[in-house]
C-alpha cells in the first residue's frame, strides 16, 4: 500500500449519508491523536471515507465486516 | 521525508484575486489527491477544493464555485488554487493536504500529510 504505517490519518469532515454496504470491503479508526474520531471505510475501488463512528449505520458496517 | 509547502497568500482588497501554489515531496504524487482546506479564527475547518493527481477530477466546496479553481502541474509535483472575486469571508489560513487516492468523498477523505498553511486576508 502506498498510505505507510508511518503516517497518522485523520478526518476532519464526516460523509453525510450511508454509503452502499456492498461497496465497502474493510474499515480502520483514526488514531486517538486526531481531533475528531472516525472509522475509515475502504471500498471496493481503494476510496477512503471518514465517517462518523457515533452513527448507527456505521457501527452497524462494522459489525457486519467483523461478521464477514 | 514529506513535504507540502504553500506559498502564495497575502493581503488584498475585496474583488482581488491570488494564486496559492502547493509544492509536494517526498511520496508519489500521483497516489494522492491534493486538496485545500480553510480555516478563519473560531471556525471549523473547510474542505474547499481538490485534484486527483492520477486523473485530474476535481472537486469545490459550493461556497468558491465559479470563483477558485485548482490544477496541477505534475511535472512539477505542485498543485495551484486560484482565487478570483475574493470577499472577506474567503479570509482564513490556507493549508494543503493529500489525501488517498481521488477527489470522490473529499472532504470526507482521511488527510494523510498537511502543509502549514499561508494566511489570506481580504480587506473590504
Known amino acids: 500500500s502506498p498510505y505507510s504505517s508511518d503516517t497518522t490519518p485523520c478526518c476532519f469532515a464526516y460523509i453525510a449519508r450511508p454509503l452502499p454496504r456492498a461497496h465497502i470491503k474493510e474499515y480502520f479508526y483514526t488514531s486517538g491523536k486526531c481531533s475528531n474520531p472516525a472509522v475509515v471505510f475502504v471500498t471496493r475501488k481503494n476510496r477512503q471515507v471518514c465517517a462518523n463512528p457515533e452513527k448507527k449505520w456505521v457501527r452497524e458496517y462494522i459489525n457486519s465486516l467483523e461478521m464477514s | 521525508e514529506v513535504q507540502l509547502v504553500e506559498s502564495g497568500g497575502g493581503l488584498v482588497q475585496a474583488g482581488g484575486s491570488l494564486r496559492l501554489s502547493c509544492a509536494a515531496s517526498?511520496?508519489?504524487?500521483?497516489?494522492?489527491?491534493i486538496g485545500w482546506f480553510r480555516q478563519a479564527p473560531g471556525k471549523e475547518r473547510e474542505g474547499v477544493s481538490c485534484?486527483?493527481?492520477?486523473?485530474?477530477?476535481?472537486y469545490s466546496a459550493d461556497s468558491v464555485k465559479g470563483r477558485f479553481t485548482i490544477s496541477s502541474d505534475n511535472a512539477k509535483n505542485t498543485v495551484y488554487l486560484q482565487m478570483n472575486n475574493l470577499n472577506p469571508e474567503d479570509t482564513a489560513a490556507y493549508y494543503c493536504?493529500?489525501?488517498?487516492?481521488?477527489?470522490?468523498?473529499?472532504?470526507?477523505?482521511?488527510?494523510?500529510?498537511w502543509g502549514q498553511g499561508t494566511q489570506v486576508t481580504v480587506s473590504s
Open positions: 493536504a493529500a489525501a488517498p487516492p481521488d477527489c470522490t468523498y473529499y472532504p470526507a477523505t482521511p488527510i494523510y500529510y
Open positions: 517526498g511520496f508519489n504524487f500521483d497516489d494522492y489527491a
Open positions: 485534484i486527483s493527481s492520477s486523473d485530474g477530477s476535481t
